[in-house]
């Protein structure tokens, strides 16, 4: 009686179970009464990453420099190429098909996490006691100057965008 289900790494065709092709190889002929499944290795710049019955290998991803991409990890017959972005850019999606410049944190905000090739800058508002007066992709919020430690007093209060202004203490005669 012909099988209705096959073992792992097999597939059902013409009422018989045939072996799947291993990762890195494509199917060129189903098994027959007289022969096993016939598979051939994927060509240069092609891959298949699972046990399969694909008749064509997938093309490796192209990391297009015109889109700001570069190769992070070269593909093999069993894995796709992994792209990342050039310095100063990050991927627009998880699949990293294009790149955009890193975001700068505006005055009043500091860098919480510096951008990588795959993630954008994460900014945070400067909390009380801290400020940022620049638009930057690297600068964190800086603490207000401590006037006391310089034997000075606050003449102008700080904000999230400006430092405090220190001045000499009023001498009472």
């Amino acid at each position: 009686e012909p099988p209705t289900a096959c073992r792992e790494k097999q597939y059902l065709i013409n009422s018989q179970c045939c072996s799947l092709c291993q990762p890195g190889q494509k199917l060129v002929s189903d098994c027959t009464e007289f022969t096993e499944t016939e598979c051939l290795p994927c060509g240069e710049s092609e891959f298949l990453d699972t046990w399969n019955r694909e008749t064509r290998c997938h093309q490796h991803k192209y990391c297009d420099p015109n889109l700001g991409l570069r190769v992070q990890q070269k593909g093999t017959s069993e894995t796709d190429t992994i792209c990342t972005c050039e310095e100063g850019l990050h991927c627009t999606s998880e699949s990293c098909e294009s790149c955009v410049p890193h975001r700068s944190c505006l005055p009043g905000f500091g860098v919480k996490q510096i951008a990588t090739g795959v993630s954008d800058t994460i900014c945070e508002p400067c909390p009380v006691g801290f400020f940022s007066n620049v638009s930057s992709a690297f600068e964190k919020c800086r603490p207000w100057t401590s006037c006391e430690t310089k034997d000075l007093v606050v003449q102008q209060a700080g904000t999230n965008k400006t430092d405090v202004v220190c001045g000499p203490q009023d001498r009472q005669r």
Epitope: Q10, S19, V28, S29, C31, T32, E33, F34, T35, E36, T37, E38, L40, T55, R56
Partner: antibody
Framework: QVQLQESGPGLVKPSETLSLTCTVS????????VHWIRQPPGKGLEWIGV???????NYNPSLKSRVTISKDNSKNQVFLKLSSVTAADTAVYYC????????WGQGTLVTVSS | DIQMTQSPSSLSASVGDRVTITCRSS???????????LQWYQQKPGKAPGLLIY???NRFSGVPSRFSGSGSGTDFTLTISSLQPEDFATYYC?????????FGQGTKVEIK
């Protein structure tokens, strides 16, 4: 039913290219492979190679540098070319449908001689 | 390549004799699927080979029951239980487990 018929010149000069055609019926070239096998007079059988349904090929490593197998699906024909032939390539050449090992062509004798 | 070695290369026998031909491969013919792709062919002068046995022991349709195949791994046998006049021919073993496919050198069965 499945049938295969080999054809081509029976005499080829040394150093020239041997060219044979296998015309098939009863099965479809876009879905099935075709093998070439040869047999020198009074000797054993030697697998030459195969062209698969999608056009990919496998060749016997001992002949790989000289052999090309191609096909024309629309004409139901498979072609064998063997370059730089010598007397050692004198043989009966058979074609065979993959999965139809019970059905061989009748074979065609090719003699390499000047 | 896998070498297929047949023995004997020729033998003389009489009608009614039991004939055994052996075939040894240089490496195992067991595929990772568990199947063993070992065929036996019969060839008569001026004719193409005809399939007798496939996958070691399966008789092809229309092949008389006097032909049987056995063996495993690297050692295989074709047995003709009672030789008939039409069985005088050359017999080849063949493996299709590994590319390139290879054949034994043949065993010629002649009339004694």
């Amino acid at each position: 039913q499945v049938q295969l018929q080999e054809s081509g010149p029976g005499l080829v000069k040394p150093s020239e290219t041997l060219s044979l055609t296998c015309t098939v019926s009863g099965f479809s070239l876009p879905t099935s492979g075709v093998h070439w096998i040869r047999q020198p007079p009074g000797k054993g059988l030697e697998w030459i190679g195969v062209i698969w349904a999608g056009g990919d090929t496998n060749y016997n490593p001992s002949l790989k540098s000289r052999v090309t197998i191609s096909k024309d699906n629309s004409k139901n024909q498979v072609f064998l070319k063997l370059s730089s032939v010598t007397a050692a390539d004198t043989a009966v050449y058979y074609c065979l449908g993959h999965g139809h090992f019970d059905v061989w062509g009748q074979g065609t004798l090719v003699t390499v001689s000047s | 390549d896998i070498q297929m070695t047949q023995s004997p290369s020729s033998l003389s026998a009489s009608v009614g004799d039991r004939v055994t031909i052996t075939c040894r491969s240089s490496q195992s013919l067991v595929h990772s699927s568990g199947n063993t792709y070992l065929q036996w062919y019969q060839q008569k002068p001026g004719k193409a080979p005809g399939l007798l046995i496939y996958k070691v022991s399966n008789r092809f349709s229309g092949v008389p029951s006097r032909f049987s195949g056995s063996g495993s791994g690297t050692d295989f046998t074709l047995t003709i239980s009672s030789l008939q006049p039409e069985d005088f021919a050359t017999y080849y073993c063949s493996q299709t487990t590994h590319v390139p496919w290879t054949f034994g050198q043949g065993t010629k069965v002649e009339i004694k």
